[in-house]
Amino acid sequence: KSPIFGPEEVNSVEGNSVSITCYYPPTSVNRHTRKYWCRQGARGGCITLISSEGYVSSKYAGRANLTNFPENGTFVVNIAQLSQDDSGRYKCGLGINSRGLSFDVSLEVSQGPGLLNDTKVYTVDLGRTVTINCPFKTENAQKRKSLYKQIGLYPVLVIDSSGYVNPNYTGRIRLDIQGTGQLLFSVVINQLRLSDAGQYLCQAGDDSNSNKKNADLQVLKPEPELVYEDLRGSVTFHCALGPEVANVAKFLCRQSSGENCDVVVNTLGKRAPAFEGRILLNPQDKDGSFSVVITGLRKEDAGRYLCGAHSDGQLQEGSPIQAWQLFVNEESTIPRSPTVVKGVAGGSVAVLCPYNRKESKSIKYWCLWEGAQNGRCPLLVDSEGWVKAQYEGRLSLLEEPGNGTFTVILNQLTSRDAGFYWCLTNGDTLWRTTVEIKIIEGEPNLKVPGNVTAVLGETLKVPCHFPCKFSSYEKYWCKWNNTGCQALPSQDEGPSKAFVNCDENSRLVSLTLNLVTRADEGWYWCGVKQGHFYGETAAVYVAVEERKAAGSRDVSLAKADAAPDEKVLDSGFREIENKAIQDPRLFAEEKAVADTRDQADGSRASVDSGSSEEQGGSSR
């Protein structure tokens, strides 16, 4: 007996779509082997129509796809625009068509509903509007117009021209009688519900000479679109509900048990706590369409999502909706990186950001998530040499270590830096990741003076004290600029006296600037790293002034001035907006497996023992 399972019979009508799910035991071999859908011939063969290796028969071109869900042990064959020619016997299977790993499926496509018995068929999506047109003859022009719904054996009055409205339709129905030239009245029903579906009869006049017209209203619940994204990655739901709801509150909700749909985010300012820091509802276009981006996907994010429009900002009967079924692939190509990074006031953090290594030339960005209104993410820095003004001297985006990871360093931390940050690129939109920076109690590990003033033409020596815990690290000084931090020569001055309980392994490493010029003014960082992995940094601002008295300056910690005031927000403020980070591609190309090797202990801020997903700002 074959271990493959699926629907034995599928019945549909012309013009419809079907989604045929085939289940297989999710062994390693099965998950990665070829999946196929073939049609059985009269003489026993089975001709492939579509397979997971990219083959699509001309019969299915543009109307079918096959999606494998290895995590669930399923694959789904979607076939649209069905015709009666599609009726027949099929197999869904694994491996080679002729081998036994398959399941027989009978597909029967019947004729679509037509104008049978003078019945006009109206097929409308849930939540939308239908206009039922009812013609009549001149002799009934002045007579009562009415619409009935067939309930069981009896017609029930829905609306009439004398002003009656059935309570089930209150506030969402109207009867329009066209101008004298047209012998037609119409009934408009808004916010269609599933329960509105059925047989209707419109009538002009009440006697034997009345004009009657039958209508069949079909209300379609939207088929969920299958979305399959990687754990730790990102998903974008594009929601286009039509211009008629452009001014109505929008929402995205996730269906829980039964019919409940818990609001994830809406335009009225509501946001589910589980999505804090990792969701954006992008401003809607004039036509009422909008999109929702969720980053840092978790296993528990999988499920059925609905977007819709309703004044309450949540799902109600009659809301127009769109639906998605989100699957989260745990065999993710996106490497694990800490979701929480901890730093101390005055200290620093080094954040590792993954990106699709196939896109090494893409522009890298880092932005700060803001929860106000629907959420936004103003850019702070990019890999093209742009840094937001008030982050000058304390923020740098480095292409290192490369090969699928870049580094963002932020120092001179204050409590205001606590929050959620997004790593992203202008390439693969699925690789947006989120990291939370937490500011914890403690002292910075590296000790440097505050502001330093150098004298033109003289020599300046600036000290940086490294505690003994960094004895095995590479220590460096560099000069900060918009494109990074250019390494400078430095001198190891031997053990530092700046630390209590620290042995000979502590170090004082000095930066020496000979014959200071105006160009030497700016921010300097001292820091530690191991190979291409960065740890803590400390920043010093060097001001340059005219000579007052000859000699060189040797700055000590005690002589240092206070740190300069934080710079004000500049007018070049940039922000991730609808167009900047949106991309309609919901499905990524097959991605190369990312480098997930552990970084050397302490090569970046240390991992907190409480969680493998947290990393501290100070190394062990």
Epitope: V10, N11, S12, S17, V18, S19, Q255, E259, Q325
Partner: nanobody, 126 residues
Amino acid sequence: EVQLVESGGGLVQSGGSLRLSCAASGRTFDQFTVGWFRQAPGKEREFVTAIRWSGSTTYRYYADSVKGRFTISRDNARNTVDLQMNSLKPEDSAVYYCAGQMSQWSDPRGDDYDSWGQGTLVTVSS
């Protein structure tokens, strides 16, 4: 919360037929999937058949042991899902349960159904 009630069980001779019904109350029967399961004394509950619908498309699933003998159908007017059982065998004797499932993607043979009926007893005598 939807309540499911099975009916139609009883005693029947081997080779005979029986029709079980699963009626929904509490709200309209617009669940995506309704399945029939059975449990014989001292045995584990097993999947029998399921019907899944979405708009005007219907998917029917059967266990190997009942293929060709049992037919599942949906009656919109009565708001029921019916199980027509022909060519009954003594090994079909069991308590038959119907279950409703919201998810359109779960394996219909699985146990992640949202609501279950109390069951109806079917006895097939030889």
